[in-house]
């Protein structure tokens, strides 16, 4: 391709408008002033520049702002944001939630890209914590966002932000993540009454300890099997048959269908067969009658 540098006579851009889509790449480079582009970034989004042309415009901004774009430019990047690399974004200082929303909107409907992940990381680090408004925004665009964070990152979520979390936002969370989120949720919802509390806390119960499950069993919550199956195995094992029966209520019949799956399978192995028989579900695999159960972990603790 021919290398041309001087802007042809009469082609100097006085404003960013659709006439520029007729410019070749070299003409854009030569005829569009970077400062003009920066002040009229909001217009770029309305013009169907090709990706090639966008590369030129990006290059001009990079030259103007080698240390990173100011937020006034970032907020109006529009689909030029898709041309940014994570390295570019790491130079930015994004503090406005409106800027974040504007850029997430550009990527709407797509998987979370490395660019978006970097943008969110920069934004959250700049704020110091995941406040409720930020969490609201992020989970609206990416329901799985919360579960993409490490337990360490989740520790910066204040309990007040938990109110923004919807059940589907936790679908892909693993037990380690729920271990961090559950105590925050417990704190956030502590002033709610029994049934309302259970509705809110239910999605977080994969991080609940045994004593909290025992407490719930006294409140007629009727936990469904899907929730029960997500509980920590180590939290379920110490529950008695009576406690599980109270916890599940009418859903207790569902144990039969899950008897080969964790945590039900492991829980059955810990129960006396006599006690299991009281459920009338035909659950098998409990400790036979007359056998003595030694809790070796307790014995080790004593010695």
């Amino acid at each position: 391709e021919v290398e041309k540098t001087a802007c042809p006579s009469g082609k100097k851009a006085r404003e960013i408008d659709e006439s520029l889509i007729f410019y070749k790449k070299w003409e854009l480079e030569a005829c569009v002033d970077a400062a003009l582009l920066a002040t009229q970034m909001d217009r770029v989004n309305a013009i169907p520049f090709t990706y090639e042309q966008l590369d030129v415009l990006k290059h001009k901004l990079d030259e103007l702002y080698p240390q990173g774009y100011p937020e006034s430019v970032i907020q109006h990047l529009g689909y030029l944001f898709l041309k940014m690399s994570p390295e570019d974004i790491r130079k930015w200082n994004v503090t406005s939630l409106e800027t974040l929303k504007a850029l997430l909107e550009v990527n709407k409907g797509h998987e979370m890209s490395p660019q978006v992940a970097t943008l969110i990381d920069r934004f959250v680090k700049g704020r110091g914590q995941l406040d409720k408004d930020t969490l609201d925004t992020l989970t609206a665009f990416y329901p799985g966002y919360l579960c993409s964070l490490s337990p360490e990152e989740l520790s910066s979520v204040p309990p007040s932000s938990i109110w923004a979390v919807r059940p589907q936002d936790l679908d892909t969370c693993d037990p380690r993540q729920l271990d961090v989120l559950y105590p925050k949720a417990r704190l956030a919802f502590q002033n709610m009454n029994g049934s309302e509390y259970f509705v809110k806390i239910q999605s977080f119960l994969g991080g609940a300890p045994t004593e909290d499950l025992k407490a719930l069993s006294q409140q007629n919550v009727s936990m469904d099997l899907a929730t029960f199956m997500k509980l920590r195995t180590d939290a379920v094992l110490p529950l008695t048959v009576a406690e599980v029966q109270k916890l599940l209520g009418p859903h207790v019949e569902g144990l039969k269908a899950e008897e080969r799956h964790r945590p039900v399978r492991d829980w059955i192995l810990r129960q006396r067969q006599d006690d299991l028989d009281t459920l009338g579900l035909g659950l098998q695999g409990g400790i036979p009658n007359g056998y003595l159960v030694l809790d070796l972990s307790m014995q080790e603790a004593l010695s």
């Epitope: 309305a46 169907p48 520049f49 090709t50 990706y51 689909y79 709407k108």
Partner: nanobody, 121 residues
Framework: EVQVVESGGGLVQPGGSLRLSCAAS????????GGWFRQAPGEQRELVAS???????KYADPVKGRFTISTDTAKNTVDLQMNSLGPEDTAVYYC???????????????WGQGTQVTVSS
């Protein structure tokens, strides 16, 4: 999957005419953006003509009055009628489609493979 396919290129004498046609599947030109670009040997690609409901019909200065872009919504094609052709119009002509986003702005772009137009006696 979106596909954009050009047809109608060929060899034509100076002063002659050609009609290029671009058919798209997986995207409708109606409500989006369709255009014709060209790239002459050793030159960068340039937009020749375009049309969209958002921006209307536009032409590059060198082809104004000679080229006409039109769309057939029933066939989902964008055609380029080229009259009074000269040697300077010799190039590979590319069809271009761009998605118009409902929330404003422009989404994915799609290019055809290109069709050669040669103007020579």
């Amino acid at each position: 999957e979106v596909q954009v396919v050009e047809s109608g290129g060929g060899l034509v004498q100076p002063g002659g005419s050609l009609r290029l046609s671009c058919a798209a599947s997986g995207i409708t030109f109606s409500g989006n953006y369709g255009g014709w670009f060209r790239q002459a040997p050793g030159e960068q690609r340039e937009l020749v003509a375009s049309m969209s409901s958002a921006l209307g019909t536009k032409y590059a200065d060198p082809v104004k009055g000679r080229f006409t872009i039109s769309t057939d919504t029933a066939k989902n094609t964008v055609d380029l009628q080229m009259n009074s052709l000269g040697p300077e119009d010799t190039a590979v002509y590319y069809c271009y489609a761009r998605v118009r986003l409902s929330r404003g702005g422009w989404g994915s772009e799609y290019w055809g493979q290109g069709t050669q137009v040669t103007v020579s006696s």
